[in-house]
């Protein structure tokens, strides 16, 4: 589909005759015919196959043809085709004299025809005018001409039919041969697959629209090259997805199993050594000084109770001091300034000189214990329960009463969070669902029994005689430190005479 | 191909018994961990329990402790999941899966579950 375009330039009609020779009265009113057929080696009369156009009066004898294409489209003169254009053509030019305003051929006298011209040859399809001037004896015409394509119509013959579309159907528009051009972003034979974002996986990502990534189900990312794990997967990552690979330190099906607590948590204070014991559980190993699972807890030097014979300890910054009670001294109060003649031996005990007679020891019969023999045997004074279980006398034998989490004869056996004893200062540990409680002793608290609330165990008076009473801050325990002439725990005894013990 | 088949599922009342199977395919039994994990309606899949190669080593979600027992028959090519006083709360779709290696660390391969349901 095209047009045939024909621009009228000029006529030249000087005389102002008709092709008979006879005159115009009062002058030629020139209108034209044209009429546009296929290729004729002669050009002949008969049906104008590709189309016919007539003009109006475009002047008297000798004119100029403005172009009017901006105007009413007249000049130049359209003929328009709907078929591939052949590339060759014949054209037929009448110029007519109306004598009145009806230009039909039928109303026109057939002398009114003032000249004709008949041409044909071949034309190609492009935007280029051809210009010709066709000479009889008595005018003259100028002319131009040229095929070009109907919208929409591409091609050396019109025949390729393009319309430019941005739509699902396609993206593109026409190219001068009819060829498709696709709009930036699209791609495929007719302009309908996006282009999507550069480095988009192309198995695992897709688009339906340029410069989209979308993923995949099982993937990930900005350019859908990441895999997702299996839902739950903790500290674990994917090479496929819904995978879960653990991480170093990491176990369990969904990696949430701490394999490595200790460099995760680093749990183990003061300088302590931590050592992984399997998930979840770690063990500290204190360095000297320290206490408590995390190894939290400075330890105090009288802590381990090294004054002997009731002495009191008191904590020095380079150690530690022993106040010894009335007739003890040393280091650790471990020397007598008593003697056998002096009967220290209570319960029936057997006194014996050491040292010549600069000190004594005293053999205790069954039952009784002590450097005087003056404490009735407790079976559980050596505290054989470990793991803070209560130790009952029974007679002649003892037992074990475990607290939760514990068992064994001695409790030695554990079976809970409580096996590590957390709970500092003789406080009672208790196994809770998700850890354990510590139940503190009187004169300590804290979430482990660390922290001394001292309390004032000589308030109760607990010492006889005019006895000095000493609080020992390790044990919240009283010390009776007695005059000349007292001895006992609580200076309760005179020197020399025996008690009767109620047991 | 590696394929894991769980059956056994059903339903069952309060403080009664199940025991899953799991029977493996497309792959050497005895050079891969198995584990089992659960899921029920609208919340995150909970690994209960997994036995590693050589059946040595076993772990237990502290949810299922002491009423669950895992174990693996190399002849059968079957791993079983004992459940005991089982609870509304265990009511879920019960998988049967291994990480691929020989300890348990991962889900590489899993089945397609069976439902277990705990109601009076």
């Known amino acids: 589909s095209g047009v045939f375009q024909l621009q009228l330039q000029e006529f030249i009609n000087e005389r102002g005759v008709l092709a008979s020779g006879r005159p115009c009265e009062p002058g030629c009113r020139t209108f034209f015919r044209v009429c546009l057929k296929h290729f004729q080696a002669v050009v002949s009369p008969g049906p104008c196959t590709f189309g016919t156009v007539s003009t109006p009066v475009l002047g008297t004898n000798s004119f100029a043809v403005r172009d009017d294409s901006s105007g009413g489209g007249r000049n130049p003169l359209q003929l328009p085709f709907n078929f591939t254009w052949p590339g060759t053509f014949s054209l037929i030019i009448e110029a007519w004299h109306a004598p009145g305003d009806d230009l039909r051929p039928e109303a026109l006298p057939p002398d009114a025809l003032i000249s004709k011209i008949a041409i044909q040859g071949s034309l190609a399809v492009g935007q280029n005018w051809l210009l010709d001037e066709q000479t009889s004896t008595l005018t003259r015409l100028r002319y131009s001409y040229r095929v070009i394509c109907s919208d929409n119509y591409y091609g050396d013959n019109c025949s390729r039919l393009c319309k430019k579309r941005n739509d699902h159907f396609g993206h593109y528009v026409c190219q001068p041969d009819g060829n498709l051009s696709c709009l930036p972003g699209w791609t495929g034979e007719y302009c309908q697959q996006p282009i999507c974002l550069s480095g988009c996986h192309e198995q695992n990502g897709y688009c339906s629209k340029p410069a989209e990534c979308l993923c995949r189900p099982g993937w990930q990312g900005r350019l859908c090259n990441e895999c997702i794990p299996h839902n739950g997967c903790r500290h674990g990552t994917c090479s496929t997805p819904w995978q879960c690979t653990c991480d170093e330190g990491w176990g369990g099906l969904f990696c949430d199993q701490d394999l490595n607590y200790c460099t995760h948590h680093s749990p183990c204070k003061n300088g302590a050594t931590c050592s992984n014991s399997g998930q979840r559980s770690y063990t500290c190993t204190c360095r000297p000084g320290y206490t408590g699972v995390d190894c939290e807890l400075e330890l105090s030097e009288c802590d381990s109770n090294p004054c002997r014979n009731g002495g009191s300890c008191k904590d020095q910054e380079d150690g530690y001091h022993c106040l010894c009670p009335p007739g003890y001294y040393g280091l650790h109060c471990e020397h007598s300034t008593l003697s056998c003649a002096d009967s220290p031996c209570f319960n029936g005990g057997s006194c014996r000189e050491r040292n010549q007679g600069a000190n004594y020891a005293c053999e205790c019969p069954p039952n009784f214990t002590g450097s005087n023999c003056e404490k009735k045997v407790d079976r559980c004074t050596s505290n054989p329960c470990a793991n803070g279980g209560q130790c009952l006398n029974r007679g002649p034998s003892r037992m074990c009463r475990c607290r939760p989490g514990f068992t064994g004869t001695y409790c030695e056996l554990h079976v809970s969070d409580c096996a590590r004893n957390p709970c500092a200062h003789g406080g009672t540990c208790h196994d809770l669902e998700n850890g354990l409680m510590c139940t503190c002793p009187a004169g300590f608290s804290g979430r482990r029994c660390e922290v001394r609330t001292s309390i004032d165990a000589c308030a109760s008076s607990p010492c006889f005689n005019r006895a000095t009473c000493y609080t020992d801050l390790s044990t919240d325990t009283f010390v009776c430190n007695c005059p000349y002439g007292f001895v006992g725990s609580r200076c309760e005894f005179p020197v020399g005479l025996p008690p009767s013990f109620p047991w | 191909e590696v394929q894991l088949v769980e059956s056994g599922g059903g339903l069952v009342q309060p403080g009664g018994s199940l025991r899953l199977s799991c029977t493996a395919s497309?792959?050497?039994?005895?050079?891969?961990?198995i584990g089992w994990f659960r899921q029920a309606p609208g919340k995150e899949p909970e690994g209960i329990s997994c036995?590693?190669?050589?059946?040595?080593?076993?772990y237990y979600a502290d949810s299922v402790k002491g009423r669950f027992t895992t174990s693996r028959d190399s002849a059968k090519n079957t791993v079983y999941l004992q459940m005991n006083s089982l609870k509304p709360e265990d009511t879920a779709v019960y998988y049967c899966?291994?990480?691929?290696?020989?300890?348990?660390?991962?889900?590489?391969?899993w089945g397609q579950g069976t439902q277990v349901t705990v109601s009076s």
């Open positions: 899966a291994t990480p691929g290696i020989a300890a348990c660390r991962g889900i590489h391969y």
């Open positions: 497309g792959f050497t039994f005895d050079v891969y961990a």
């Open positions: 036995i590693s190669s050589s059946g040595s080593i076993t």
